[in-house]
């Protein structure tokens, strides 16, 4: 059985479209599961993995490897 584009699995009922944009950064494995591109995480792979050591409380990142500090915090790790 050949599935339509973006459909996977037994019965072709699993949907996955690879994307690399604001709404997700992932490929699809042979079963239609999302596999996040390097530097991205979360169920939709749209959450950047910040610089290692970046304070989860006082730092954040829009792009992988970044560490942007909240107002009033500074340093490489916003700690």
């Amino acid at each position: 059985v050949t599935c339509d584009d973006y459909y996977y699995g037994f019965g072709c009922n699993k949907f996955c479209r690879p994307r690399d944009d604001f709404f997700g950064h992932y490929a699809c494995d042979q079963n239609g599961n999302k596999t996040c591109m390097e530097g991205w995480m979360g169920p939709e792979c749209n959450r950047a993995i910040c610089r290692q050591g970046c304070s989860p409380k006082h730092g954040s990142c829009k792009l992988p490897g970044d560490c942007r500090c909240q107002y009033g915090w500074q340093g490489l790790y916003c700690d």
Partner: antibody, heavy 119, light 107 residues
Amino acid sequence: QVQLVQSGAEVKKPGSSVKVSCKASGYTFTDYEMHWVRQAPGQGLEWMGAIQPGGGGTAYAQKFQGRVTLTADKSTSTAYMELSSLRSEDTAVYYCTRRGYDDYPFAYWGQGTLVTVSS
Amino acid sequence: DIQMTQSPSSLSASVGDRVTITCRASGNIHNYLAWYQQKPGKAPKLLIYNAKTLADDVPSRFSGSGSGTDYTLTISSLQPEDFATYYCQHFWSAPWTFGGGTKLEIK
């Protein structure tokens, strides 16, 4: 279960700004974008933009670029939509909404916030 | 940007009727289409996504079909609670635009 609870109705003067809040619960706030959709009285639905609460990244519909600001407070799991330079045509119900799992479109919606712009 | 054209804009039908609403995209949206139902004073409710997949707790009388640029929502046998406004929406690429809506009224 996923819940999105919005702030109450607002009446604003033309030229002013409004800030609508959307408090999320029942899921990890930083895992999904929060989208905003508006609906003028008797009209259709209009996508305004989205924010990724984890890092603050935003995407806006061109029509609203420069006039709308989306923000998120991770500590309270609350998203905000601020619309500036209000005009009468901005009178609408504003909804926050979230995608479902496996790339669903908008499976979860807030109850809506009516913003009335009147002099 | 992809535009969505929905037709008809309004429709009168009776309980038990079979009803079809169509949506045409200005470009190929590869089945990335959703249908919503909205009742007055309420938020929209997701009915169908990926053109043909029924959302949770949606009755089987609703079905979706289509591909490429042309899509259809069918209600096989109208029930009293189905009288509402229906919207299509693509989510292929931002901006995720909606169709203009179809108001389904009791004949």
